[in-house]
């Protein structure tokens, strides 16, 4: 349970101070210095790929 007044971001997202909204942490792979990436706890897993066609 979140404390009152905390940022309402779901798992895998983080609050952007500049945009004043939650942003998807997956985008930090491409732009790691975006402000909200500071709040992304761990690197998101690499996208799943089939090893055969």
């Amino acid at each position: 349970e979140q404390a009152p007044g905390t940022a309402p971001c779901s798992r895998g997202s983080s609050w952007s101070a500049d945009l004043d909204k939650c942003m998807d942490c997956a985008s930090c792979r491409a732009r790691p210095h975006s402000d909200f990436c500071l709040g992304c706890a761990a690197a998101p897993p690499a996208p799943f790929r089939l090893l055969w066609p």
Epitope: W15, C28, D35, C40, A41, A43
Partner: antibody, heavy 120, light 103 residues
């Protein structure tokens, strides 16, 4: 209990290097961003650098960019600040702090501080 | 971030009103208290939410570029330096501080 214990300060000559450490305990270290903040004698607080929980995103104040490097060793629950090309104006008490993203990036747990003196 | 006044001289029991002004619009602001020889202590996050263990005589308000920290009735332990802090453009920034001293 939640704790940050700092080490590594001391006296260094201008142009020299120093590494500060901050050992975390009592919380899941990887879940939190961390930051370094400094305070020159008799002056206010100045943010130095911050790093995300994974270590994949780093941020620096303009005054230290290119000279200081923030890093973390998550298995060891330890935060570092490597300081190179030190100047007299880097003399300060350095604090490590835990950053709460869900607190809109407020810092809720602080180390005890370590004094770095840059002087010849 | 510009804090005013630089020093506030008040007596215990009085109300303290501290100002923090940003040069550009800020979405949320944080306040800290620092006593001599101690590390800062988180007071208010997200402009108006009290951190754990902070008494309700401390309150934060404001929006845009103007923010306020109010201490309704000063206790002896409240005499300290107070800093505001923002996070903008991937930079954390502190105000210069306001010292609340005993009159």
């Amino acid at each position: 209990q939640v704790q940050l214990v700092q080490s590594g300060g001391g006296l260094v000559k201008p142009g020299g290097s120093l590494r500060l450490s901050c050992a975390a305990s009592g919380f899941t270290f990887t879940s939190y961003a961390m930051s370094w903040v400094r305070q020159a004698p008799g002056k206010g607080l100045e943010w130095v650098s911050a790093i995300s929980g994974s270590g994949g995103s780093t941020y620096y104040a303009d005054s230290v960019k290119g000279r200081f490097t923030i890093s973390r060793d998550n298995p060891k629950n330890t935060l570092y600040l490597q300081m190179n090309s030190l100047r007299a104006e880097d003399t300060a008490v350095y604090y490590c702090a835990r950053v709460r993203a869900n607190y809109y990036y407020g810092m809720d747990v602080w180390g005890q501080g370590t004094l770095v003196t840059v002087s010849s | 971030l510009t804090q005013s006044p630089g020093t506030l001289s008040l007596s215990p029991g009085e109300r303290a009103t501290l100002s923090c002004r940003a040069s550009q619009s800020v979405s949320r602001l944080t306040w800290y208290q620092q006593k001599p020889g101690q590390a800062p202590r988180l007071l208010i996050y997200g402009t108006s939410s009290r951190a754990t263990g902070i008494p309700n005589r401390f309150s934060g308000s404001g929006s845009g570029t103007d923010f306020t920290l109010t201490i309704t009735r000063l206790e002896p332990e409240d005499f300290a330096v107070y800093y505001c802090q923002q996070f903008r453009n991937s930079l954390l920034t502190f105000g210069g501080g306001t010292k609340v001293e005993i009159k």
